[in-house]
Interface confidence: medium
């Protein structure tokens, strides 16, 4: 399987909400011993490998934001900790998973990474991630709503296996 990022750039005005999205592609083993660990974190564009550094999103680590379930099951983080920080991660039956950030400020600007780990028999088997940029803007040049820019065909299968 691999991870696609439908949009590589999100440009949003201050105060707006945004939902960053990744999509799980390819054959997904639905065996009872297979689960998927999905999460989000911030990173910086490292010279060697994008998304290699895992930094918190609004002080929440990738462990705080993770979803852990089988195949294309739906799930979401509804715990108070994430919601108090204006965050919610979710996953649907179609392989889409997302993080919603509310009330954006300039400090939310940066590189965001989604991570999917396939776990078999409690052992990590396969790990892929996708990356996207969030730019929060203010002033007369800021858009009135979030504007999203599709990934190029090469980027949309923004795959890095670990």
């Amino acid at each position: 399987f691999k991870v696609a990022t439908p949009y590589s750039l999100y440009v949003c005005p201050e105060g707006q909400n945004v939902t960053l999205t990744c999509r799980l592609l390819g054959p997904v083993d639905k065996g009872h011993d297979v689960t998927f660990y999905k999460t989000w974190y911030r990173s910086s564009r490292g010279e060697v490998q994008t998304c290699s550094e895992r930094r918190p999103i609004r002080n929440l680590t990738f462990q705080d934001l993770h979803l852990h379930h089988g195949g294309h099951q739906a799930a979401n983080t509804s715990h108070d900790l994430a919601q108090r920080h204006g965050l919610e991660s979710a996953s649907d039956h179609h392989g889409n998973f997302s993080i919603t950030m509310r009330n954006l400020t300039l400090l939310d600007s940066g590189l965001y990474c989604c991570l999917v780990v396939e776990i078999r028999h409690h052992h990590s088997e396969h790990r892929v991630h996708g990356a996207m940029e969030l730019q929060v803007q203010t002033g007369k040049d800021a858009p009135s709503n979030c504007v999203v820019y599709p990934s190029s065909s090469q980027d949309s299968e923004n795959i890095t296996a670990a």
């Epitope: 105060g15 609004r58 920080h85 400020t105 300039l106």
Partner: antibody, heavy 113, light 111 residues
Framework: QSVEESGGRLVAPGTPLTLTCAVS????????MSWVRQAPGKGLEYIGV??????GPYYTSWAKGRFTISKTSTTVDLKITSPTTEDTATYFC?????????WGPGTPVTVSS | QVLTQTPSPVSAAVGGTVTINCHSS????????LSWFQQKPGQPPKLLIY???NLASGVPSRFKGSGSGTPFTLTIYDLECGDAATYYC????????????FGGGTEVVVQ
């Protein structure tokens, strides 16, 4: 809308000091807040910022370990962990990160034995 | 990050034009996270320009900011006596952690 700093005073080197920034007319859940200082006759120095929710705090490299920024629902605190004479300055609290659009009058801190 | 302002000091006559430059050792975030401030003795700084070229609320249009990435320029047209002050640029960076830095300041003398 206003911000006002307090807590500045004369302290001995090594004695921790906490400055408080009280805000009114706007919510800290909607604005990032920064701390900036200015030594007598010198330029502005950026210390760090704390964001909405619990984004940050983030510190400039020289300030890491020397300062701690925290907040409540209506105040933002700056703790000078172990002041030295070089920390003598006026400390400003400002609304925003780069777009610092609302400043307090500043609170003076003198570090001397 | 290092923000270098030139020149300092700078002087011009009433009605004249002053240009201040701000050069960053590294591009600011989004190429436009740069602000300009005016500070007079005994007062806190006042925001003039944000995101490189946006005029802050209540600031006369005589003040103009320009530039992208680095360098940046603040131009003051039709200089008035009240414009005598020290001007600072401040850049925002999002490499590793988010942080900012100020330039060293430029004193503007109005003759």
């Amino acid at each position: 809308q206003s911000v006002e700093e307090s807590g500045g005073r004369l302290v001995a080197p090594g004695t921790p000091l906490t400055l408080t920034c009280a805000v009114s007319g706007f919510s800290l859940s909607s604005y990032d807040m920064s701390w900036v200082r200015q030594a007598p006759g010198k330029g502005l120095e950026y210390i760090g910022v704390i964001g909405t929710g619990s984004t940050g705090p983030y510190y400039t490299s020289w300030a890491k370990g020397r300062f701690t920024i925290s907040k409540t629902s209506t105040t933002v605190d700056l703790k000078i962990t172990s002041p030295t004479t070089e920390d003598t300055a006026t400390y400003f609290c400002a609304r925003g990160w780069v777009k610092l659009d609302l400043w307090g009058p500043g609170t003076p801190v003198t570090v001397s034995s | 990050q290092v923000l270098t302002q030139t020149p300092s000091p700078v002087s011009a006559a009433v009605g004249g034009t002053v240009t201040i430059n701000c050069h960053s050792s590294q591009s600011v975030y989004n190429d436009n996270y740069l602000s300009w401030f005016q500070q007079k003795p005994g007062q806190p700084p006042k925001l003039l320009i944000y995101q490189a070229s946006n005029l802050a609320s209540g600031v006369p249009s005589r003040f103009k900011g320009s530039g992208s990435g680095t360098p940046f320029t603040l131009t003051i047209y039709d200089l008035e006596c009240g414009d005598a002050a020290t001007y600072y640029c401040a850049g925002g960076y999002n490499i590793g952690d988010s942080y900012s830095a100020f330039g060293g300041g430029t004193e503007v003398v109005v003759q």
